[in-house]
Amino acid sequence: SEVEYRAEVGQNAYLPCFYTPAAPGNLVPVCWGKGACPVFECGNVVLRTDERDVNYWTSRYWLNGDFRKGDVSLTIENVTLADSGIYCCRIQIPGIMNDEKFNLKLVIKPAKVTPAPTRQRDFTAAFPRMLTTRGHGPAETQTLGSLPDINLTQISTLANELRDSRLANDLRDSGATIRIG
C-alpha cells in the first residue's frame, strides 16, 4: 500500500523523497509523475531532474529542498481536490535495473473553516521545512522490497520512521532515502 500524505485545499502539499548522492554534485536522474510508477520513467511527468539540474517542470510543481544534496521532495502549490491521488517518485540509480520507485498517496481535504489549533501552528513554526505540510505525517507505513545487490545502504521510508509529528525533526534523515556509493 502507498504511504499517505495529507494537505488542505489552498495549501501547499509536500511529498518527501530523498537519496544521498555518492559525491557532492554527482546527481542521479529523478522523475515525479501523477499516477503510480510504471515500469519505466514516471507516468504523466510533472517534474524531472537530470545529472545536473531540474530539466522539466510544470506549473505548481517544484522542488523546495536542495535537490543537489538529494532532497527531491515535491511541493505542489495551492492544491485542489483534483490533486488527490498517487504520485510516483523514481530515482534512476545508474546500473542494470537499479531504479528505486516510491508511490505516495496524496489526500486533499476541504479547507477547514475554523483556524488551525495552536499546537499545529507551533509545529509548523518549529519546523519551517514543513511549513507547506501543516505537519501531517503519513497515515500508514509501507515496507519496501530489498535493494538490488549494489553499493547502497538499506532504504528507510519516511513512513517507517515518522510515526507522528513529534518525530518531525528526524525528517531529513528518515525520508524515503537511498544512499549511493
Partner: antibody, heavy 119, light 107 residues
Framework: EVQLLESGGGLVQPGGSLRLSCAAS????????ISWVRQAPGKGLEWVAA????????YYADSVKGRFIISRDNSKNTLFLQMNSLRAEDTAVYYC????????????WGQGTLVTVSS | ETVLTQSPVTLSLSPGERATLSCRAS??????LAWYQQKPGQAPRLLIY???NRATGIPARFSGSGSGTDFTLTISSLEPEDFAVYYC?????????FGQGTKVEIK
Amino acid sequence: EVQLLESGGGLVQPGGSLRLSCAASGFTFRTHLISWVRQAPGKGLEWVAAITGSGGSTYYADSVKGRFIISRDNSKNTLFLQMNSLRAEDTAVYYCAKDGGSGSYDDFWGQGTLVTVSS
Amino acid sequence: ETVLTQSPVTLSLSPGERATLSCRASQSVGSYLAWYQQKPGQAPRLLIYDASNRATGIPARFSGSGSGTDFTLTISSLEPEDFAVYYCQQRSNWPPTFGQGTKVEIK
C-alpha cells in the same frame, strides 16, 4: 519528423555475436528512454531491453539478461544492442522504439532489422 | 509476469462494421495499457496509450476504454486500411508484456 532506422541485422551462427544500431532523428534523443522489441517470424511482440535517456539505467528481459547489452551514444543520436551467445530462439525482427515520455508506451517505432540465428 | 490475453484471436468483419477487441490482464495494470496496430511487413503503430488516449494522428473511430484488468479497443466503423493485427501492451508491472494479438480480417 521522428525517424528511427535500425541496421546491423543478418545471419549469424548459434553462439555468435551481432551488434544492432538504431539511428534516431527528429526529436531530442538524449531525453528519451528507448527500447528494443523483437518479433519472431509469424509471432507476436516481445520486449527485449530499454535504456534511459542519459544511458545510466538499463533494463533487460530475463530471456536476454547476461547476453545482450543495450547502450547509446547521445552525441551521435544512436542506440545499440550488442547481442552475444546468440541462440536460434533469438531469430526475429528487432525494432527500436521511442518512449512517449512517460514510460507507459512507445510512440514511434523503426522499421526493424532481421536477425537470423542458424547453422 | 503479467499475462495479457487478447480475444478473439481472429475477428472476421466487413468494412463499415464495428470491431470490439478485448485485452484482459492477469493482474491489475492500472491504466498503463497501450494498443498498437501492425500491418504485414510494417512496424507497430501506436493507437491508444494509457488505456483511453488516442495517439497523435489516429482517427476518431479508434477508441480505448477500461482500467485494472479489462480493456477494450473499439473501431466504430471499419475502414479497409484497418484490417491488421492489434496488440495490447502493459507497462505497469515488471516486465513489460504484450498480448498475443488479435487479427482483424475481411469477412
